[in-house]
Interface confidence: low
């Protein structure tokens, strides 16, 4: 069965799934897609790495943690109700038959009130879109509402404290991380 | 196999104007950022401009800013620079170079073989 | 903007000499460092991305190293097709910048 995540409507969810590579900058190609996992590759891709790098996205479907380090957890911008359903997270070790997959659930709930931006620093708050003119530079970060503003290494801090404590739990109830190597 | 290929080049007077053209195969340019580097004769390298996967944001140099426009036409896997207002100092090799969507992994994998614009009365 | 200062502007080396070549940014650019060679009417050719990852197909005496705002590219033993100009560039923030360039010629 599927591990089960909520989001309101009008924040940010966050899926995670990780790997640890063999070595350093030794990545493994990655994609999520909407739907469950298929036999081969993932259906409806939403975001794709290759061996280097983040090489395919779509609108609201960030990378926001280290995923040179094999934090490949999505984060879905300012959801909808549309966006409930399964994601697969879709791990494609080299070899036959080898990919890891994982189907994550994502429950919409529908807001209580008008979502307005927030201060709290939890799962939705911690990993804004970061928004400038083209890159993703601190020194051009804007946050979308009035989020805290959040460099690229506060949010990998912020990764590592949120997977070393609440998201660890997840994980290894959830078994959504594997070691390659 | 991965190329880019500029076209467009050529000689015109101050406050010309010229179209260039980086024709990509290989790869599906809605995917990836392209840049447009210029080197002027015996100098080094300098970045022009660059538009993202879904033609979304474009970005320039201070130098060009209000000059030169950007633009995508992924039908056709092609990137274009429209250069209005040329200077002297614009005179250089024009290169195109394919970048990936986060900037902080945005260095430049493949470059096209350049095309010389040459500014000159 | 961003400045990258490249140092030196160029050297006169030997094949089988160890080379270093060293860039400093004038702020902080976490590792969103690449280092390209280019050779005379050639584009330029990516080698070194995000300060120290080798790039696909480049040999393994290049390499690539950061010290906070300090990056340098080792070349560990110079061969006769490395003779060639080195740039480095910032890709943290727009503009991306390079630096001036390193030309390595034959000693």
């Known amino acids: 069965s599927e591990v089960e995540y909520r989001a309101e409507v009008g924040q940010n969810a966050y899926l995670p799934c990780f790997y640890t590579p063999a070595a350093p900058g030794n990545l493994v190609p990655v994609c999520w897609g909407k739907g469950a996992c298929p036999v081969f590759e993932c259906g409806n891709v939403v975001l794709r790495t290759d061996e280097r790098d983040v090489n395919y996205w779509t609108s609201r479907y960030w990378l926001n943690g280290d995923f040179r380090k094999g934090d490949v957890s999505l984060t879905i911008e300012n959801v909808t109700l549309a966006d409930s359903g399964i994601y697969c997270c879709r791990i494609q070790i080299p070899g036959i038959m080898n990919d890891e997959k994982f189907n994550l659930k994502l429950v919409i709930k529908p807001a209580k009130v008008t979502p307005a931006p927030t201060r709290q620093r939890d799962f939705t708050a911690a990993f804004p879109r970061m928004l400038t003119t083209r890159g993703h530079g601190p020194a051009e970060t804007q946050t979308l509402g009035s989020l805290p503003d959040i460099n690229l290494t506060q949010i990998s801090t912020l990764a590592n404290e949120l997977r070393d404590s609440r998201l660890a739990n997840d994980l290894r109830d959830s078994g959504a991380t594997i070691r390659i190597g | 196999e991965v190329q880019l290929v500029e076209s467009g080049g050529g000689l015109v007077r101050p406050g010309g104007s010229l179209r260039l053209s980086c024709a990509a195969s290989g790869f599906n340019i809605s995917n990836y950022a392209i840049h447009w580097v210029r080197q002027a004769p015996g100098k080094g390298l300098e970045w022009v401009a660059d538009i993202t996967p879904d033609g979304g944001y474009t970005d320039y140099a201070d130098s060009v800013k209000g000059r030169f426009t950007i633009s995508a036409d992924t039908s056709k896997n092609t990137a274009y620079l429209q250069m209005n207002s040329l200077r002297a100092e614009d005179t250089a090799v024009y290169y195109c170079?394919?970048?990936?969507?986060?900037?902080?992994?945005?260095?430049?994998?493949?470059w096209g073989q350049g095309t010389l614009v040459t500014v000159s009365s | 903007d961003i400045q990258m200062t490249q140092s030196p502007s160029s050297l006169s080396a030997s094949v089988g000499d160890r080379v270093t070549i060293t860039c400093r940014a004038s702020?902080?650019?976490?590792?969103?460092v690449a280092w390209y060679q280019q050779k005379p009417g050639k584009a330029p050719k990516l080698l070194i991305y995000s300060a120290s990852f080798l790039y696909s197909g480049v040999p393994s005496r290049f390499s690539g190293s950061r010290s906070g705002t300090d990056f340098t590219l080792t070349i560990s033993s110079l061969q006769p097709e490395d003779f060639a100009t080195y740039y480095c560039q910032q890709h943290y923030t727009t503009p991306p910048t390079f630096g001036q360039g390193t030309k390595v010629e034959i000693k």
């Open positions: 702020q902080d650019v976490n590792t969103a």
């Open positions: 170079a394919r970048g990936y969507v986060y900037r902080m992994w945005d260095s430049f994998d493949y």
